[in-house]
């Protein structure tokens, strides 16, 4: 996350850690007690390694008595997703066992009203990406509001190029920004969830290029049939 | 641990190019950026440049736009800057950093005829 | 390009006594890092997003500051704190070092 700040701890019981070989890979959203929502493009390289879900925590590094690692049983891609563009870009990780609740751990609504967020409709991204232009990686989530875009602006030839679609939403970008790290978590808007941040190459923090989600509403079918 | 390993000294000739090389153990590079950065006696630190080695993507200086290109290959975990058309403006010691938190150790590199 | 002067260009302390060296930005930026670099030695970071204290550095090193003014203190100057320290922007591309202040130990 750029330009954000630290979260208050455990104040968003639904995110969650997507882990490769025990280290933070993407953000992730608990959506049902044994189901976390990430970006498809995550697990494209965990193909021999070990894909955990970190939920409870606030801290990735310190001991906090709410944070709990859980093994993945299943993964579910879109079947649509492909490596070289960001549509489609979902997946459904189902916990090896129904995620213990309470205060710090707690599935998120998510939209089902397939109806665009009004622009600049301020809304809530959190992850454990870098937070600088180094690329400095946190320990402690952040967290940043930021103002919708209409997808008409986000389509110009001088942002993303009529890449964005009607199953995609656009927040702005102008030095706050999601980033490399906070691919597969939660953009929440009036504290339901509306956007999965994407995972591909774009730059962040430039106002021309803004943040990409993929919006869950249009993906409220396959959702529900993965969960049954 | 985490190390940044680079290669060895360079004694060059005007006009020819140098590809320096930074391996990366107790870290993937592709995690975050790697960082390239130029010394010279009495100029100080300048960065040249950076790396997204999960998507290649890099950013560079203006000022050396043309003279350096900064590749990764995630497999080996290395990261390269190589420099081209050699002048003794480029004489220096060019440092690798991962997340201009770790560095290493720093490649001498001498350009003469 | 954001332009960053560190002042003073060269410095001498006691040990024990408190050093302050700062960094003055052309325009307004929204962090500093500070870094220290002995002779030989590749540079170490200290200090990330003004203030925050990199892992493994001695808690008398403190960063502060905002907008076009940022420094660097060090609270009890000790010998092995005679080094070159360079401040970096991160906050306006393409990203910037000081010129260095150079400490050392009277």
């Known amino acids: 996350i750029l330009g954000g700040r630290e979260a208050e701890a455990h104040a968003r019981p639904y995110m969650a850690s997507v882990q490769l070989n025990g280290a933070h890979l993407c953000g992730g959203v608990l959506v049902a007690e044994q189901w976390v929502l990430s970006a498809a493009h995550c697990l494209e390289d965990a193909a021999d390694g070990k894909v955990q879900v970190l939920l409870g925590a606030h801290s990735l590094s310190q001991p906090e008595p709410s944070k709990r690692l859980y093994d993945v049983l299943r993964a579910v891609p879109h079947p649509d997703s492909q490596p070289d563009t960001i549509d489609h870009d979902l997946l459904l990780l189902q916990l090896s066992e129904k995620a213990t609740l309470g205060p710090a751990v707690r599935p998120l609504p998510w939209q089902r009203v397939d109806r665009d967020v009004a622009p600049g409709t301020l809304c809530d991204v959190a992850g454990w990406g870098i937070v600088n232009h180094a690329g400095r990686r946190p320990d402690s989530l952040q967290h940043v509001l930021l103002p919708v875009l209409d997808r008409a602006t986000c389509n110009r030839r001088t942002h993303h190029d009529g890449a964005i679609t009607e199953r995609l939403m656009c927040a702005e970008s102008n030095r706050r920004d999601s980033c490399k790290g906070d691919s597969g978590g939660p953009l929440v808007c009036g504290g339901v969830l509306e956007g999965v941040v994407t995972s591909g190459s774009r730059v962040c923090g430039n106002r021309k290029k803004p943040g990409i989600y993929t919006r869950v509403a249009s993906y409220a079918a396959w959702i529900d049939s993965v969960l049954a | 641990e985490v190390q940044l390993q680079q290669s060895g000294a360079e004694l060059v000739k005007p006009g020819a190019s140098v590809k320096l090389s930074c391996t990366a153990s107790g870290f993937k590079i592709k995690d975050t950026y790697m960082h390239w950065v130029k010394e010279r006696p009495e100029q100080g630190l300048e960065w040249i440049g950076r790396i997204d080695p999960a998507n290649g993507n890099t950013k560079y200086d203006p000022k050396f736009q043309g003279k350096a290109t900064i590749t990764a290959d995630t497999s080996s975990n290395t990261a390269y800057l190589q420099l081209s058309s050699l002048t003794s403006e480029d004489t220096a010691v060019y440092y690798c950093?991962?997340?201009?938190?770790?560095w290493g150790q720093g490649t001498s590199v001498t350009v003469s005829s | 390009q954001i332009i960053l002067t560190q002042s003073p260009a060269i410095m001498s302390a006691s040990p024990g006594e408190k050093v302050t060296m700062t960094c003055s930005a052309r325009s307004s930026v929204s962090n500093m890092y500070w870094y220290q670099q002995k002779p030989g030695s590749s540079p170490r970071l200290l200090i990330y997003?003004?203030?925050n204290l990199a892992s493994g550095v001695p808690v008398r090193f403190s960063g502060s500051g905002s907008g076009t003014s940022y420094s660097l203190t060090i609270s009890r100057m000790e010998a092995e704190d005679a080094a070159t320290y360079y401040c970096?922007?991160?906050?306006?591309?393409?990203?910037?070092f000081g010129g260095g202040t150079k400490l050392e130990i009277k």
């Open positions: 970096q922007q991160w906050s306006s591309y393409p990203w910037t």
């Open positions: 950093a991962n997340a201009m938190d770790y």
């Open positions: 997003d003004t203030s």
